[in-house]
């Protein structure tokens, strides 16, 4: 009874299509696979950024797989062929592992790369990234930003840089069609006549870095002798009402009475008739139904009632 063996996949490699971190892992079928022509051969692929403790594991019938990686670090991957038990009269047969690595040869010392990179997607409409130049770099150093997300044919360079002292320190992005809910890849590289500049790679999803506009049209309405309803409207823009959380801060006679987080555009406040001044502000943030994270908006303009009988008047700013 001869032992059934299968070869590992051939030509296993990590291919960088120039998408700033979105890589292809590709391989060819093992030699002598035709002996198992009636079988559905599978491949077990394991991969990770070097330094990560855990491998991602995929089992596939395909000859390729795609995923995003942090190009600031190297990537390692391994793959073997799996023959299911149906092909081998009983037990699954695995080939030896084929292994490969990939990394971008770093230029320049780490201190030359951009510092304090910060990206904000204002009101789910306008992406702006800013950074500080690397430590100890000369004024002739200039940084260039490139970006890619699935849907673009190739990586694009920023066309509207924010400058300080002649250096690029940020980028205002154009309208980014169909760019949310997918990985957004950025590379900031640099050039200098004096020394090589280290590139930096960043990956995020746009819906997680949204900073909305503050709410508008704040109003008071007396609901009863001891209740006041505070109301506001969602900010103008593309973000639907269902995507907002709000934080309100209410002050009564210069004392913070309430800080609360609510999901709707109303809040009912218990008060007494002795209240002489009532003010509130609201800010908004994209909620967990629409993103995994977000940035609070600025506070709205303050809306106040002062020295009048709230039972007689609805105040509209």
């Amino acid at each position: 009874d001869t032992e059934i063996k299968v070869n590992p996949p051939q030509d296993f490699e990590i291919v960088d299509p120039g998408y700033l971190g979105y890589l292809y892992l590709q391989w060819q079928p093992p030699l002598s696979l035709d002996h198992f022509k009636e079988c559905t051969v599978e491949y077990e692929l394991k991969y990770r950024n070097i330094g990560s403790e855990t491998w991602k594991t995929i089992i596939t019938k395909n000859l390729h797989y795609k995923d995003g990686f942090d190009l600031n670090k190297g990537i390692e991957a391994k793959i073997h062929t799996l023959l299911p038990w149906q092909c081998t009269n009983g037990s699954e047969v695995q080939s030896s592992w084929a292994e490969t690595t990939y990394w971008i040869s770093p230029q320049g010392i780490p201190e030359t790369k951009v510092q304090d990179m910060d990206c904000v997607y204002y009101n789910w409409q306008y992406l702006l990234c800013s950074w500080k130049p690397g430590i100890g770099v000369l004024l002739d150093t200039n940084y260039n930003l490139f970006y890619w997300y699935e849907g673009l044919d190739h990586a694009l360079q920023c066309v509207d840089y924010i400058k300080a002292d002649g250096q690029n320190i940020g980028c205002r992005f154009p309208y980014l069609e169909a760019s949310d809910y997918k990985d957004f890849y950025i590379c900031v590289n640099g050039s200098s006549e004096n020394k090589p500049i280290r590139s930096s790679y960043f990956t995020f999803q746009l819906q997680n870095i949204v900073k909305p506009l503050p709410p508008v049209y704040l109003t008071f309405t007396r609901e009863s002798s001891c209740e006041i309803k505070l109301k506001w409207s969602i900010p103008l823009g593309p973000i639907p009402a269902r995507c907002f959380d709000y934080e309100i801060e209410i002050r009564e006679d210069d004392t913070t009475l309430v800080t609360a987080t609510v999901e709707n555009e109303t809040y009912t406040l218990k008060t007494t008739n002795e209240t002489r001044q009532l003010c509130f502000v609201v800010r908004s943030k994209v909620n967990i139904y629409c993103s995994d994270d977000g940035i609070w908006s600025e506070w709205s303009d303050k809306q106040c009632w002062e020295g009048e009988d709230l039972s007689k008047k609805t105040l509209l700013r």
Epitope: V15, Q28, L63
Partner: antibody
Framework: EVQLVESGGGLVQPGGSLRLSCAAS????????MSWVRQTPDKRLEWVAT????????YYADSVKGRFTISRDNAKNSLYLQMSSLRAEDTAVYYC???????????????WGQGTLVTVSS | DIQMTQSPSSLSASVGDRVTITCKAS??????VAWYQQKPGKAPKLLIY???YRSTGVPSRFSGSGSGTDFTLTISSLQPEDFATYYC?????????FGGGTKVEIK
């Protein structure tokens, strides 16, 4: 439409050099291995060289090893063949060919260019 | 290196004929054999890979069979556009070699 277009052929003296190019379009170039195959004046087909999809794996026919260099630029969707120390027996039509990709096999050629003629003669 | 020996080197046939071309490998290549069609002044065109799998758009009158060392390309009913030269190729392991070709001519 999937297309391969070769260029760079011509007349060259023995011992000379030539660089062939192949421009690919209509498919994801970085997904496929690519090869050069030549057809001699007596109509025989001869595999010359293959480069894997990412360029990490390269194979040459013994007859060209050490004289020819295959390379690719995935960003430009281009395949190249640098030929040096050319001999009369290298005279042929050189085809750029895409390596097929199926779950069973990949070393056949499923798309071919129109070919470019290389003539080595004094 | 694996040699591919094709026969016949040429044949004459009429429209509607059944045509068979054979290819013999010098060693076992499993089912790793492809067949190509080439017309004058044109590049080869893939017909069959892995011995019996028709390439996209290839008419069903073309079929391939065989394994190990003996392989066959069959054209079940020859059409006017099928007059051409046919090549076999093994795609088992480098170097990948071709047969010498079979020219199918009009009788």
């Amino acid at each position: 439409e999937v297309q391969l277009v070769e260029s760079g052929g011509g007349l060259v003296q023995p011992g000379g050099s030539l660089r062939l190019s192949c421009a690919a379009s209509g498919f994801t170039f970085s997904r496929n291995g690519m090869s050069w195959v030549r057809q001699t004046p007596d109509k025989r087909l001869e595999w010359v060289a293959t480069v894997s999809s990412g360029g990490s794996y390269i194979y040459y026919a013994d007859s060209v090893k050490g004289r020819f260099t295959i390379s690719r630029d995935n960003a430009k969707n281009s395949l190249y063949l640098q030929m040096s120390s050319l001999r009369a027996e290298d005279t042929a039509v050189y085809y750029c060919a895409r390596q097929g990709t199926t779950a069973l096999a990949t070393r056949f050629f499923d798309v071919w260019g129109q070919g470019t003629l290389v003539t080595v003669s004094s | 290196d694996i040699q591919m020996t094709q026969s016949p080197s040429s044949l004459s046939a009429s429209v509607g004929d059944r045509v068979t071309i054979t290819c013999k490998a010098s060693q076992d290549v499993g089912t790793a054999v492809a067949w190509y069609q080439q017309k004058p002044g044109k590049a080869p065109k893939l017909l069959i890979y892995s011995a019996s799998y028709r390439s996209t758009g290839v008419p069903s009158r073309f079929s391939g069979s065989g394994s190990g060392t003996d392989f066959t390309l069959t054209i079940s009913s020859l059409q006017p556009e099928d007059f051409a030269t046919y090549y076999c190729q093994h795609h088992y392991s480098a170097p990948w070699t071709f047969g010498g070709g079979t020219k199918v001519e009009i009788k």
